[in-house]
């Protein structure tokens, strides 16, 4: 029963000047000489948002994003020279996209840029506290970027920097043909996963990376990397793209002689997000945009976003699935992916699987092997050439909790907020698309608590001009959300509670976790007020139960849309 | 230089048991998987267990596994086997070598086990 | 189990001849397998390792060759300290196995 199916509309659609005139929108409408704000790193303690964009880093004050600094990263004449004779476009590649913006330490960020197909790093001073409004580029000190931001600008690079070590899914060379996933800095010597071997990764597009603890032993910590790539053939009929989420432990260091430096504890499982279709045929979102990880009191069991959208030019489609991380260990512990048979077909593999199981991290924990190094040739051998788990993994409740279809644009960010209501938590989902626009969607558990329904809250144009959303950013101190795209970045609040009318009806029907009658207006709602007339019923969206005061009037009819 | 000796071989009843000891010396024991081999007389090699370096795991053919247990005390430089159920067919002369997790590089003159009825 | 076939049970060669030893798995290997020789009354001695690295102090007329289940050891010319019993010994999986031997003989 899809709801969401049904491309329920808005309670309220905001223009970008209907959200300007209502003091919704801050933008930053980028600068002459660069472009391409695609990549963020919030700083709530600094209360920064640092973006990396075309030869420059910016830092924007979280409370306004008017108030910014700026560096300037070029590349010099001689690179840029090198680029355009090596047949690269002047203006849209031989420029320093910023690709990696990372926490290095207390006191500085990492950064990488393309470098005009010569991918290059360094270290970004911000001092200890944010009183000392330092922002400055290491310009004494550069380093190799390859393996860390891809050379083409058009492709992505999913990393994550911890203890000093950068965990990077990018294009590792000119052609961006030879993709990979890297560990870079550090003591140790660099790690990658095996080359030119498609069952490892094939042309893969990287989403993000995240570390994740798999126990109590931070020893059996993992990195997760979640992906899109092509299917390998035989596993589907005809060329198909397929979601992944990859594994890798922390303390993975290679084989002691075969994956010599190379990842052996690296697996990897599709991700389903479909729904059936009339003929039989399910209908897959394959193509995963972006993933966001909402954390439980458990840390090692955060719920999994994806925003996913069609391959098919003749459907076009979107959807947000969501996933169990015990059901991602779940696959990971079973049947590896193996071919044989007459037609070469995946099958699961029955055979004896070596021990430590291939894929589980060493430590204390299992068996005592210390290292990787550690392990005996056979689970490497294992390791190498079954680096595919045979079954998927599948969204909660095995389908999407939301879907667009037949509308003209397609989602592309996914950010998350878990909101106290009245009645309960509610996860609010702020949904990106490929058009400037900003939806905001609310799960409400219908008759059970996994039986959910979507109820489309808002959807907000944030840009001037249509223009694909490519980053997202929640701050939830702030109560602020930022966007990124080619044109700039834009700051809009959680919520906009006013907005939804001068009576306790309409804010009650308007079903905003954020928002609540407080007896004269419709405004925020905290939980630990102790005020007793408040009204809110996110679940129901009943008003006539909660608002005694005859609010109810005869505005019930129009309070659906602005226009 | 390498050395590696066995000792605890020797005669024994059917269903007894017995320990042998191999003290290793001239490379970095903790460093290293260590195995054991065993020759019937007359036959060829047979492998019986490999420890991994830290002692937390060990690997064993079905013919002697839940009757032979290799242990090694990292501390001491030895390796141990401990076998217990001994058949007729367990007779042979017993290596200890150094290796397992590749191939077994070095190996001792070896101690000799008779199991009788 | 992974089983090795040694062929040929014994060769008789004489000294400065070629042998040619073959070991064969019953499935695919790679090129985990190693050569060892042993001599009456002495304890194995690892002669090539991964099919066909070669270790320090070991002469250089013993080569090893092949991958997946067809394996070599050559000796290019025998010298009369050669002879003796060869084993190859599959380290893929576990259980880690031997093959049967080959004994080369004085002719």
């Known amino acids: 029963n899809y709801a969401n199916g049904k491309n329920n509309v808005p309670r309220l659609k905001l223009s970008y000047k209907e959200m300007l005139e209502s003091n919704n929108v801050i933008t930053f409408n980028g600068l002459a000489n660069s472009s391409s704000y695609h990549t963020f790193l919030l700083d709530e303690e600094r209360s920064r948002l640092y973006v990396g964009a075309k030869d420059h880093i910016f830092s924007f004050n979280l409370v306004n994003i008017k108030d910014f600094q700026k560096i300037v990263w070029p590349v010099s004449y001689t690179r840029r020279d090198e680029c355009k004779w090596a047949g690269k476009d002047i203006l849209k590649e031989c420029a320093n996209f910023i690709k990696v913006l990372k926490a290095y330490n207390q006191t500085h960020l990492y950064a990488c840029g393309t470098g005009a197909f010569h991918p290059i790093c360094t270290y970004i001073e911000v001092g200890h506290h944010p009183e000392d409004n330092i922002f400055k580029l290491q310009d004494s000190h550069f380093e190799n970027g390859r393996g860390k931001s891809p050379y083409d600008p058009k492709l992505l690079t999913a990393s994550l920097l911890i203890d000093g070590e950068l965990y990077s899914g990018t294009a590792a060379d000119f052609m961006g043909r030879d993709f990979a996933i890297f560990r870079t800095l550090g003591h140790h010597h660099p790690i990658r996963t095996e080359q030119h071997d498609s069952r490892w990764l094939n042309d893969p597009r990287f989403i993000s990376a995240h570390l994740i603890p798999e126990s109590d032993n931070p020893e059996d910590d993992k990195v997760y990397f979640f992906f899109r790539e092509n299917a390998i053939d035989g596993e589907h009929s005809g060329k198909a793209t397929h979601a992944r989420i990859g594994q890798i432990c922390k303390n993975d260091f290679g084989g002691h002689r075969s994956l010599v430096n190379k990842w052996t504890t690296f697996l990897k499982a599709r991700l389903i997000c479909s729904v059936p279709g009339p003929n039989g045929i399910d209908t897959h979102f394959d193509e995963l945009q972006d993933v966001f990880l909402m954390n439980s009191k458990d840390p090692k069991n955060p719920i999994v976003y994806g925003v996913f959208t069609t391959s098919s030019n003749i459907f076009k489609g979107s959807a947000v699935c969501m996933y169990s991380m015990s059901d991602v260990r779940r696959v990971f512990l079973g049947p590896y992916a193996h071919r044989d048979g007459p037609n070469y077909q995946w099958v699961p593999y029955q055979g004896r699987v070596p021990y430590p199981r291939p894929g589980t991290c060493p430590s204390k924990t299992f068996g005592g092997f210390d290292s990787t190094k550690d392990l005996p040739d056979d689970v490497i051998t294992f390791a190498r050439s079954h680096p595919a788990m045979y079954n998927p993994v599948f969204p909660i409740n095995n389908r999407p909790i939301m879907i667009k279809t037949d509308v003209n644009y397609q989602f592309t960010q996914i950010v998350v907020d878990r909101v106290d209501a009245e009645d309960g938590q509610y996860d609010v989902m702020f949904i990106g698309t490929d058009v400037g626009t900003v939806l905001k969607v609310v799960s409400v558990p219908k008759e059970t608590w996994h039986d959910l329904e979507e109820v489309l809250l808002e959807e907000m144009t944030v840009f001037r001009e249509p223009t694909t959303i490519s980053a997202m950013e929640l701050s939830t101190k702030q109560q602020q959300l930022y966007i990124g795209s080619t044109a700039g970045v834009a700051q809009l609040p959680l919520h906009r509670c006013d907005i939804y009318g001068k009576a306790c009806a309409e804010c009650c029907l308007a079903r905003d976790p954020y928002c609540a009658w407080d007896g004269s207006s419709c405004s925020r709602y905290f939980p630990t007020a102790k005020a007793r007339t408040r009204a809110q019923d996110i679940r129901n969206g009943d008003p006539l139960t909660h608002c005694s005061d005859g609010g109810i009037e005869g505005r019930m009819d129009h309070h659906h849309h602005h226009h | 230089e390498v050395q590696l000796v066995e000792s605890g071989g020797g005669l024994v009843q059917l269903g007894g048991s017995l320990r042998l000891s191999c003290a290793a010396s001239?490379?970095?024991?903790?460093?290293?998987?260590m195995s054991w081999v065993r020759q019937a007389p007359g036959k060829g090699l047979e492998w019986v267990s490999t420890i991994i370096k830290s002692g937390g795991y060990a690997y064993y053919p079905d013919s002697v596994k839940d009757r032979f247990t290799i242990s090694r005390d990292n501390s001491k430089n030895t390796l141990y086997l401990q076998m217990n159920s001994l058949r007729a067919e367990d007779t042979a002369v017993y290596y200890c070598?150094?290796?397992?997790?590749?191939?077994?590089?070095?190996w001792g003159q070896g101690t000799t086990v008779t199991v009788s009825s | 189990e992974i089983v090795l076939t040694q062929s040929p049970a014994t060769l008789s060669l004489s000294p400065g001849e070629r042998a040619t030893l073959s070991c064969r798995a019953s499935q695919s290997i790679g090129d985990y397998l190693h050569w060892y020789q042993q001599k009456p009354g002495q304890a194995p001695r690892l002669l090539i390792y991964?099919?066909?690295q070669s270790i320090s102090g070991i002469p250089a007329r013993f080569s090893g060759s092949g991958s997946g289940t067809d394996f070599t050891l050559t000796i290019s010319s025998l010298e009369p300290e050669d002879f003796a019993v060869y084993y190859c010994q599959q380290g893929y999986s576990f259980p880690y196995t031997f093959g049967g031997g080959t004994k080369l003989e004085i002719k």
């Open positions: 070598v150094k290796g397992g997790q590749g191939a077994m590089d070095y």
């Open positions: 991964y099919a066909s």
């Open positions: 001239g490379f970095t024991f903790s460093s290293y998987y």
